[in-house]
C-alpha cells in the first residue's frame, strides 16, 4: 500500500514538473510573440508613415537618383560630422562619379555658395592612400587636388567644384548621404 502511494506521489510530481515546463514554454512563447508584435508594429508604423509621406527622402534632404543628401547648417570637425550623419542613419558623402560630383557642386551653388563641406574621404596615415569611409578607393578623377602638409590626420572636403584636403580637426560644414527609399509601386 505504501509503495502504491509512493508511486502515485512520484507520478503526481512528474506531472507537476511537466506542467511547470509547459507553463515555462508558454511564457517564453508569449514573450516571443510580444516581441514579434513589437517588431510588427514598428514595421507597420514605418511602412504607414512612409506610405503617407511617400517621399524617397526625408524633409530638408535633396534627392539625386538612388541617394538623399543633407547639407548641414552647422560647422563641426570631421569626426563629429561623421557622428552627426550616423545619428540620422546616413554617412558622410561618398562621391562615386563625376555626375554625382557635378550634382553636388551644382546644388551647393544654389543653396549656399562657396563654403567648405566635409565628405567621407580620409587619408591613411601610414600608406598615404585616400579611402572612402566604407574602405573603397576613390576613382582617379576624384582625388583631392592638393596634398595637405598637416602632420595631423587629413580629410577630404568639397569647395566650389573641387575636392580638397585639410586637417580633420578644422571646422567645416558637412554633407550626409543615405539611400533613397524605393517606391514599392
Amino acid at each position: 500500500k505504501l509503495l502504491q502511494v509512493s508511486t502515485i506521489a512520484m507520478q503526481q510530481q512528474e506531472k507537476l514538473i511537466q506542467q511547470e515546463r509547459a507553463l515555462l514554454n508558454f511564457t517564453e512563447w508569449k514573450r516571443s510573440c510580444a516581441l514579434q508584435m513589437k517588431y510588427c508594429q514598428a514595421f507597420m508604423q514605418n511602412s504607414l508613415s512612409s506610405a503617407h509621406n511617400s517621399s524617397p527622402c526625408p524633409n530638408n534632404w535633396i534627392q539625386n537618383r538612388e541617394s538623399c543628401y543633407y547639407v548641414s547648417e552647422i560647422w563641426s570637425i570631421w569626426h563629429t560630422s561623421q557622428e552627426n550623419c550616423l545619428k540620422e542613419g546616413s554617412t558622410l558623402l561618398q562621391i562615386e562619379s563625376k555626375e554625382e560630383m557635378d550634382f553636388i557642386t551644382g546644388s551647393l551653388r544654389k543653396i549656399k555658395g562657396s563654403y567648405d563641406y566635409w565628405v567621407g574621404l580620409s587619408q591613411d596615415g601610414h600608406s598615404g592612400r585616400w579611402l572612402w569611409q566604407d574602405g573603397s578607393s576613390p576613382s582617379p578623377g576624384l582625388l583631392p587636388a592638393e596634398r595637405s602638409q598637416s602632420a595631423n590626420q587629413v580629410c577630404g572636403y568639397v569647395k566650389s567644384n573641387s575636392l580638397l584636403s585639410s586637417n580633420c580637426s578644422t571646422w567645416k560644414y558637412f554633407i550626409c548621404e543615405k539611400y533613397a527609399l524605393r517606391s514599392s509601386v
Partner: nanobody
C-alpha cells in the same frame, strides 16, 4: 533610452581574430545606426566602425581591410569581425546606438592583443 550588451572580448595573439557581438534592447525603433568605439588607456575614444539601418558602412582608417561590421536589423544586433589583430588594437570596445536624439553606449568589453 537604448540598452546595449556586448560580448566576445578577450585575449588574443597578434595576427589572430576575434568577433564582438552587441545586442540592443529598449527603444530599438529609434536606432538609425549602430557601431563600435574603442578607447585605449590614455587615448581618446575613437569610432572604429558603424553601419546604418540602410546598410551604409563607415570604418576608421586604421581598421580598413581588417575589420568587418555587420548588423541584423530584425534582431537589433551588431557584430564586429576583427582579423589580423595588432597590439595597437588593444582597448575597451564599446557598442554604440545612434539616434537623432544622441548616442547610447554599452559598458564595453576588453580586447587585449599580445605580441
Amino acid at each position: 533610452q537604448v540598452q546595449l550588451q556586448e560580448s566576445g572580448g578577450g585575449l588574443v595573439q597578434a595576427g589572430g581574430s576575434l568577433r564582438l557581438s552587441c545586442a540592443a534592447s529598449g527603444s530599438i525603433t529609434s536606432i538609425n545606426a549602430m557601431g563600435w568605439y574603442r578607447q585605449a588607456p590614455g587615448k581618446q575614444r575613437e569610432l572604429v566602425a558603424a553601419i546604418t539601418s540602410g546598410g551604409r558602412l563607415s570604418y576608421a582608417d586604421s581598421v580598413k581591410g581588417r575589420f568587418t561590421i555587420s548588423r541584423d536589423n530584425a534582431e537589433s544586433t551588431v557584430a564586429l569581425q576583427m582579423n589580423s589583430l595588432k597590439p595597437e588594437d588593444t582597448a575597451v570596445y564599446s557598442c554604440a546606438a545612434f539616434q537623432s536624439s544622441g548616442i547610447d553606449w554599452g559598458q564595453g568589453t576588453q580586447v587585449t592583443v599580445s605580441s
